[in-house]
């Protein structure tokens, strides 16, 4: 029986470890600055890295600019978006800016898009200063179903900071759905 | 066999509980305002509390101003940094401020430092108002290896809000590395 | 013995799944804008949704405007608060604003209230712009005991953005207390 107990313990340890890892999808996606759209209107950001530098993904899928959920669960979602302007980049079309981020969820089954989180600020970036910077952080806990897609929309994408430590979003699964 | 099963269940419950706790390092460190450097340039903040008020640490180490990882894993890292100025504190050398935070990772094996997250804002804190305040929050999900160190750099450290609810950073382990 | 092992494995799987779910309370509460207090002073926000749209709660209780902890543990707490003003809403009493959030913990056993996290900014919302917006995000990792209550205080509540994606707070349990 001792040998049997050891076998039970061993198989359980494997199972527990395996199921724990399988049960915890995550992603941390960083901005791909080679393909940032211009303009000041709200746009969906579709170019993100998933496998270089700090960017990584496991048990989720990145496709067509969207983070796709592969496993039902409750996830913590977050985004950090940095905007910046230096006078050497040229004059701003307007000094009154609305710098915003929207984290949206799209369901393919019911083709609809909903904003889960938003954040940002109106700013007056006057010519009296040669450099301007502003960051937004949002985060929240959401129920996500397999097949649902998470995407990021921002205003003034041409002002985005292209560094991987500046503009990114991510998710990690916290628990199953009852 | 029933007794044996009970023993297996019992030992497993202990093991599961124990391994779950051991597998989840965390830290929440609050600013130690008795030793904040002056100056406006970017500096590393080395004085943090780890065992008073809201500050706490488990299965991680705080040493030489850095949060040291003791256990490989994927961690959620976060920081909240508040800056404030009251006219009674004296005159600002410049009303144009760059209020920033950088969360950095240092590897001792490969002596290099990299910024994981940054946030902040440029501000114009004019003399027209007697009080100014601004907070930054950043957070993200990162793979950390045992021995790696997390530290916080800020600009204008003399403007930091010294309250434990204002200026802090932390981490908690979410999952093992596959 | 094989049957016995299968029974052990089966019962363990049930127990592990059940205990995992039971061990992970969470809440995501969104602002109920039908009952937002007026004024510019700091007030406690007592009207939140817990069961519509993105709002949800499990193994925690929402009562009298407070999120009540039912299970000891270490929790990640977060809040996202958005303020906005459009000139069509009328003139601001002052253009110099202090837009703040305070996440507080109240213990009934020891009737005291303490601020866990704060964030915000002073703002100059001049009449030169027809629309103003600003968001705050805070988050941190805290030890909470059964019966303790989490509440949200803000300044200038009449400026709150009433959207569920804008003004919300939440918590999820990460691990047990040793």
């Amino acid at each position: 029986i001792r040998a049997e107990k050891a076998m039970v313990d061993g198989s359980w340890l494997d199972l527990a470890k395996r199921s724990k890892l399988e049960a915890q999808p995550f992603a941390h996606l960083t901005i791909n600055a080679t393909d940032i759209p211009s303009g000041s209107h709200k746009v969906s950001l579709s170019s993100w890295y998933h496998d270089r530098g700090w960017a990584k993904i496991s048990n989720m899928t990145f496709s067509n600019g969207k983070l796709i959920v592969n496993q039902d669960g409750f996830y913590y979602l977050y985004a950090n978006i940095c905007f910046r302007h230096h006078e050497t980049s040229g004059d701003l079309a307007t000094e009154y800016l609305q710098l915003m981020v929207y984290v949206t969820k799209t369901s393919i089954k019911i083709p609809s898009s909903h904003t889960l989180m938003k954040g940002g600020s109106t700013k007056y970036w006057s010519g009296n200063s040669e450099f301007h910077f502003y960051s937004i952080n949002v985060g929240g806990f959401f129920k996500l179903r397999s097949g649902e897609e998470i995407s990021i929309e921002v205003s003034n994408p041409s002002l985005l900071d292209p560094d991987q430590d500046a503009t990114y979003f991510g998710a990690f699964k916290v628990r199953d759905i009852d | 066999i029933r007794a044996e099963k009970a023993m297996v269940d019992g030992s497993w419950l202990d093991l599961a509980k124990r391994s779950k706790l051991e597998a989840q390092p965390f830290a929440h460190l609050t600013i130690n305002a008795t030793d904040i450097p002056s100056g406006s340039h970017k500096v590393s903040l080395s004085s943090w509390y780890h065992d008073r008020g809201w500050a706490k640490i488990s299965n991680m180490t705080f040493s030489n101003g850095k949060l040291i990882v003791n256990q490989d894993g994927f961690y959620y890292l976060y920081a909240n940094i508040c800056f404030r100025h009251h006219e009674t504190s004296g005159d600002l050398a410049t009303e144009y401020l760059q209020l920033m935070v950088y969360v950095t990772k240092t590897s001792i094996k490969i002596p290099s430092s990299h910024t994981l997250m940054k946030g902040g804002s440029t501000k114009y804190w004019s003399g027209n108002s007697e009080f100014h305040f601004y907070s930054i929050n950043v957070g993200g999900f990162f793979k950390l290896r045992s021995g790696e160190e997390i530290s916080i750099e800020v600009s204008n450290p003399s403007l930091l809000d010294p309250d434990q609810d204002a200026t802090y950073f932390g981490a908690f382990k979410v999952r093992d590395i596959d | 013995i094989r049957a016995e092992k299968a029974m052990v494995d089966g019962s363990w799987l049930d127990l592990a799944k059940r205990s995992k779910l039971e061990a992970q309370p969470f809440a995501h509460l969104t602002i109920n804008a039908t009952d937002i207090p007026s004024g510019s002073h700091k007030v406690s926000l007592s009207s939140w949704y817990h069961d519509r749209g993105w709002a949800k709660i499990s193994n925690m209780t929402f009562s009298n405007g407070k999120l009540i902890v039912n299970q000891d543990g270490f929790y990640y707490l977060y809040a996202n608060i958005c303020f906005r003003h459009h000139e069509t809403s009328g003139d601001l009493a002052t253009e110099y604003l202090q837009l703040m959030v305070y996440v507080t913990k109240t213990s009934i056993k020891i009737p005291s209230s303490h601020t866990l996290m704060k964030g915000g900014s002073t703002k100059y919302w001049s009449g030169n712009s027809e629309f103003h917006f600003y968001s705050i995000n805070v988050g941190g990792f805290f030890k909470l005991r059964s019966g303790e209550e989490i509440s949200i205080e803000v300044s200038n509540p009449s400026l709150l953005d009433p959207d569920q994606d804008a003004t919300y707070f939440g918590a999820f349990k990460v691990r047990d207390i040793d």
Partner: nanobody
Framework: EVQLVESGGGLVQPGGSLRLSCAAS????????MGWFRQAPGKGREFVGF????????YYGESVKGRFTISRDNAQNPVYLQMNSLRPEDTAVYYC????????????????????WGQGTLVTVSS
Amino acid sequence: EVQLVESGGGLVQPGGSLRLSCAASGFTFSRSAMGWFRQAPGKGREFVGFITGSGGTTYYGESVKGRFTISRDNAQNPVYLQMNSLRPEDTAVYYCGVYRRTYISSTYSESSEYDYWGQGTLVTVSS
């Protein structure tokens, strides 16, 4: 890399005027407070003047008060030192530096409180 470049120096007769400028490059916030110092041959670095980031506050060394004026463009860059009624004892190499503190302290006249010194520009006052 942060660089400060002083210019505008030269030879001038006593009683004459010169305008020095200090341009910052390589760092993203030249709206810092700045200071002017000078160093005559064989002497230590002497405080000339200080200006806040907004230009709203200025301080001067005793030996130049009433004769020298520091200013800065509304568009931040560069910082100027207008020198009038020059004297032979004003002969020196003039340097600008970035004030390193957030608050104006009583030590604003000490060169150790400044960073990113430029190469300097020589001013010679002689007939």
